[in-house]
Amino acid sequence: ELFPQWHLPIKIAAIIASLTFLYTLLREVIHPLATSHQQYFYKIPILVINKVLPMVSITLLALVYLPGVIAAIVQLHNGTKYKKFPHWLDKWMLTRKQFGLLSFFFAVLHAIYSLSYPMRRSYRYKLLNWAYQQVQQNKEDAWIEHDVWRMEIYVSLGIVGLAILALLAVTSIPSVSDSLTWREFHYIQSKLGIVSLLLGTIHALIFAWNKWIDIKQFVWYTPPTFMIAVFLPVVVLIFKSILFLPCLRKKILKI
Amino acid sequence: ELFPQWHLPIKIAAIIASLTFLYTLLREVIHPLATSHQQYFYKIPILVINKVLPMVSITLLALVYLPGVIAAIVQLHNGTKYKKFPHWLDKWMLTRKQFGLLSFFFAVLHAIYSLSYPMRRSYRYKLLNWAYQQVQQNKEDAWIEHDVWRMEIYVSLGIVGLAILALLAVTSIPSVSDSLTWREFHYIQSKLGIVSLLLGTIHALIFAWNKWIDIKQFVWYTPPTFMIAVFLPVVVLIFKSILFLPCLRKKILKI
Amino acid sequence: ELFPQWHLPIKIAAIIASLTFLYTLLREVIHPLATSHQQYFYKIPILVINKVLPMVSITLLALVYLPGVIAAIVQLHNGTKYKKFPHWLDKWMLTRKQFGLLSFFFAVLHAIYSLSYPMRRSYRYKLLNWAYQQVQQNKEDAWIEHDVWRMEIYVSLGIVGLAILALLAVTSIPSVSDSLTWREFHYIQSKLGIVSLLLGTIHALIFAWNKWIDIKQFVWYTPPTFMIAVFLPVVVLIFKSILFLPCLRKKILKI
């Protein structure tokens, strides 16, 4: 059998990607077509795909740390570490590396797609039209301060998050991980991993900014993808924080 | 102890980064605020950070080749290679790989931050303002030949320099370096390394272009970061060139 | 001897790069200078180089899979797999990994150069001039639908092709390939490799779009580089498809 450890992560990634693709297609392409006959099919190759990629990436990254949370809760519930985990959890725990690498793969793709935005003809033509409109409106200054801040911050956090994820990926190369002590490897994978999940989540939240309360975002009463995307990471981070509290931390270390 | 060989490089990188950050903050944000109440805090997440990254990267890369220069000078002074190096130099020589990898890490970050420039809202809004102003001035052609040349050259050199640095990084992967003969590995690390330092330095100098004599660059009588950044690399390259002269080269090879 | 397996691939890459560079220089720089005294020398560092890189990349990638095609034809002709291949084919077969890695190296450079386009001053000044002209012409909408589609598709395909090529490159790291079964490694290198060649070729063809019949593209009666670039990949893909036909496939498997 080819790539046995990759089956589950690839299946999950494919399911999330397909669902997100259809969902985004509905909101970004089908809705404008149905409601005002606007043809936005050109958005599919890049803009729609680039809504799918971060969704898959952050979800897969959350799925790297979620089994650890569940395992800790199971151990706390059982009061011992010697009781065997359920089979599905065991299987999941063993494929965390693959989930993480897939998450990195999608994150890199998301970065490249994002960096390609300003080189596209569609962006160029939009810019020229905006410039034309600005002249027509006799508007000297296009600057929107809060929008500038929003983008400077989320782009910067996204890059740093990707950089940390890259460190995790590099240390997953067999010969690199072999050159590290178990403690060093564990330190990178656990500490830096959670930091990258945190940065990715903040990146998504700052991307969202004030869109949470913008009624225009709720197309056909559906929430924008970023709202769905941050749900699982936020849950994982909350549980990680709770398990990090001194009282629970002592209990887990005892077990 | 975790990552013992990484302590020195990370400490040095953190010190350079912190100092450059504060220095750039002073020049780019504090100065306009203090002198004319201009709020440029939005520059911190990307523009200020992206002055720090190349500074750290090129300095760390210079610090990979500086101990070799010092070692050669020490050997020439001693007239023998059997006399032990001072402890600090020995320690430094053993962490060159880490310095190099950190330099590459910061260079990649610098590249990504730079590539993100045109996708930022701040850049879009500025572009729209420039377009409006060009129409207002009835200026048919915005082209500034020397400025175009400057950027085409420094961007191209930067990419090539980064590509060579990437080759060095890849050959540092244990299983890759193991598949090379010692001569092959040494060839890549020494020859290509110096080429990448040279390209990085020229990249910085062409970025500087005519800014050396532009009085506006000297904010509160402080030189711009690129002037400080190129100092160490230029020193290393000069000494490398001197030690490459036939007379000295023969002496070193004899030793 | 340093890097014996890299000699042939580097030589071939250098020859293709030099010829493409001179060819592009002739078409993009010399021709406008000779015919209408337009100085386009500024195009050399990025625009000319970035015509060379994809040409070299896709040709090298085609040269990874061409020897396999030739070997299959030779075996079909001989009716046996026990007859020795000619020395040149043998040598070529043994350097396919190097051809592939070089192809990936040039593809990554092509991607970075392409992503750097909108950050260049030349692009900024052109944009501003276009905006000025649009206002002067009182043209409300700059949008060209087919041009938008063309770029959205070819950029997207290019990124996906590069991503697959990256997977091939990663699995070429000795410790990574050692961790895979032979079947897994072969699956990635053969199946994914051909997919990336296919995507790269479609990327080039969609970049070409309607330029095949645009007389302006034939400068001094010379075809544009993409026409030359896609020739070899198309030949390889056609032969691969033919050899994939059930009748021939059975014969090859028998042998």
Epitope: D141 | K126, Q137 | -
Partner: antibody
Framework: EVQLVESGGGLVQPGGSLRLSCAVS?????????WNWVRQAPGKGLEWVGY???????SYNPSLKSRFTISRDNSKNTLYLQMNSLRAEDTAVYYC?????????????????WGQGTLVTVSS | DIQMTQSPSSLSASVGDRVTITCKSS????????????LAWYQQKPGKAPKLLIY???TRESGVPSRFSGSGSGTDFTLTISSLQPEDFATYYC?????????FGQGTKVEIK
Amino acid sequence: EVQLVESGGGLVQPGGSLRLSCAVSGYSITSDYAWNWVRQAPGKGLEWVGYISNSGSTSYNPSLKSRFTISRDNSKNTLYLQMNSLRAEDTAVYYCARERNYDYDDYYYAMDYWGQGTLVTVSS
Amino acid sequence: DIQMTQSPSSLSASVGDRVTITCKSSQSLLYRSNQKNYLAWYQQKPGKAPKLLIYWASTRESGVPSRFSGSGSGTDFTLTISSLQPEDFATYYCQQYYNYPRTFGQGTKVEIK
């Protein structure tokens, strides 16, 4: 030291034409500065007429209804203001003034050097 | 066009007095993208050409005495002479260079009391 010296003023009939010159010394007009014409009617305030940039592009006050044209002679390092279809309300002292050329960081600049002015009288 | 309104149109003051001239624009002169206010102040003495005192609303031109200061942002600006000197009796103009056409205030004449 930069010096701007205007000349060519005088008495002109309504409907007539006049060409004012501004000789610049100590600085090249094709260097990184733009050159403005500003006028001041007797006992009145200042009014901007138009400008020519170092690259040669021009912009005018729309109120002048394209009666005025700014040009330059690079070899003489001199700017010109060609005034056609002159009216009584064009009577003023005409100044030429220098401002730093537009740049992409600071955009526009104020007029830092002015000539002593030349008087144009439009009267029958 | 941007309208510039100066007040007062004239004022009488003595040597050593603190003098304040205000200038209002019909729209904001602040470019948010570079946080600069595109307003200049000029001094003109009878029969002479205007002289630049302040640019970007608050930056003193080199050689201008420190008693001259500019302040304000957006649409409201002020020129202050902290201690009036005999040579300061002149007409002062504000000017916007935020867009074209450039426009000036009608001027404020500072006379000896």
